[in-house]
Amino acid sequence: DGCKDIFMKNEILSASQPFAFNCTFPPITSGEVSVTWYKNSSKIPVSKIIQSRIHQDETWILFLPMEWGDSGVYQCVIKGRDSCHRIHVNLTVFEKHWCDTSIGGLPNLSDEYKQILHLGKDDSLTCHLHFPKSCVLGPIKWYKDCNEIKGERFTVLETRLLVSNVSAEDRGNYACQAILTHSGKQYEVLNGITVSITERAGYGGSVPKIIYPKNHSIEVQLGTTLIVDCNVTDTKDNTNLRCWRVNNTLVDDYYDESKRIREGVETHVSFREHNLYTVNITFLEVKMEDYGLPFMCHAGVSTAYIILQLPAPDFRAY
């Protein structure tokens, strides 16, 4: 059929709750393309009728809710003027084990998500909720071991649960829950998170060293594509996260819709004493709004930025 297979994504999901997957693969999906979803190599596209339990919503496939029989491989076909690409998504649906309904009806949580809190620090957990904008998400509630979390040490901040002065007792099984409303119907979304505690000082016990960038500006022409590497050295056993942010937001979140600026896949080279990590940021097309804005590379507690600036005019041309 002339379509190029890009990659296979595996997702393990809970039955009886909503699920959505967005078909994006920059730079392919950043241009003028059409996106069509299919199930199990069927020639018939997934319905676009919003009343259908499974339907395509713009570039998303949306299950309202997921059911046992929905397991299988789904294909997303991305067609451009002169190209065709295909992403395969392997969905496996399982039944969650629930708490005794007499004590609140929350799940006996699996290790579906794993997150770490840092002992003695102020830290946070994230509720991963990925749905199209047609889905209105109600306030997020947080639970630990099936009991709703309350108390002075906890603050719900958007999709985060802030935890101040993390203690060993904070390890355990958490869940975040929200009511999703779509076309007047309500569904419960509930994600399980297994939380462990690390005793490392700071975020990982070492201060990572950012080799590049070095808090400097880069001259780049308007409209060009730009890729900048962030190179970081860190200890071999570190648990530090490395990422690019703009306006205090992960670039992939900040440019969630347009995908114009994306973080690359992290790679690393292992040396005897340390690891060298590289994570890039790609500007598919530099726009005026990018100039003068600090794009920050974060590695644990270390940060460094680049600022894009227009090249100085070449007066020799006049």
Epitope: S124, L157, E158, L162, S164, N248, T249, E257, E289
Partner: antibody, heavy 117, light 107 residues
Framework: QVQFQESGPGLVKPSQTLSLTCTVS?????????WNWIRQPPGKGLEWIGY???????NYNPSLKSRVTISRDTSKNQFSLKLSSVTAADTAVYFC??????????WGQGTLVTVSS | DIQMTQSPSSLSASVGDRVTITCRAS??????LNWYQQKPGKAPKLLIY???RLHSGVPSRFSPSGSGTDYTFTISSLQPEDIATYYC?????????FGGGTKVEIK
């Protein structure tokens, strides 16, 4: 719970520097997020002034950039605003707030600063 | 700067009425749109973030929608405690900017 308390003089003379401090409890300002100043002149709308992030980098509204400095004292879990060369147009209620990935999620109760001789 | 234009600037409605406020951005803000409620003499409170997500403790009668440059905020059944000024705010591009506000009153 994350909470804020703004403090500073309620009256500042024209041409002087306005100085305010925001004391944060319930979360370390060096752990994450951006810590913001926002103002609201009496009977008017809201204007974002600037932020200092958890890593210490700052960003200011271009309309005020030449006059604004935001700094922090991590030992006291405080961040501060200095606005120089004030005029009557700077009379406003000044709020501090935490910005999550998307929004100004929690705010202090605000403090009124009047610029008058 | 991105200009945020809110309408109407004020409205008067009866308890139980459906109330809609609109917010238009001067350019596409990719759903980075938040709504706040401010009562006299108080700080603004976050109601909705990222176009369609309700903040902690916000009742379901507050209903958001929109995309691109146009966003709406609906109170399905106005309650006496909803009397306030409502602001939209874009978080897409620095400097972050607010709409001029919509004052909601009871008839």
């Amino acid at each position: 719970q994350v909470q804020f308390q703004e403090s500073g003089p309620g009256l500042v003379k024209p041409s002087q520097t306005l100085s305010l401090t925001c004391t944060v409890s319930g979360y370390s300002i060096t752990s994450d997020f951006a810590w913001n100043w926002i103002r609201q002149p009496p009977g008017k709308g809201l204007e974002w002034i600037g932020y200092i992030s958890y890593s210490g980098d700052t960003n200011y509204n271009p309309s005020l950039k030449s006059r604004v400095t935001i700094s922090r004292d991590t030992s006291k879990n405080q961040f501060s605003l200095k606005l120089s060369s004030v005029t009557a147009a700077d009379t406003a209620v000044y709020f501090c707030a935490i910005r999550g990935p998307y929004s100004f999620t929690y705010w202090g109760q605000g403090t009124l600063v009047t610029v008058s001789s | 700067d991105i200009q945020m234009t809110q309408s109407p600037s004020s409205l008067s409605a009866s308890v139980g009425d459906r109330v809609t406020i609109t917010c238009r951005a001067s350019q596409d803000i990719n759903n980075y749109l938040n709504w706040y409620q401010q009562k006299p003499g108080k700080a603004p409170k976050l109601l909705i973030y990222y176009t369609s997500r309700l903040h902690s403790g916000v009742p379901s009668r507050f209903s958001p929608s929109g995309s691109g440059t146009d966003y709406t905020f609906t109170i399905s059944s106005l309650q006496p405690e909803d009397i306030a000024t409502y602001y939209c705010q874009q978080g897409h591009t620095l400097p972050w900017t607010f709409g001029g506000g919509t004052k909601v009153e009871i008839k």
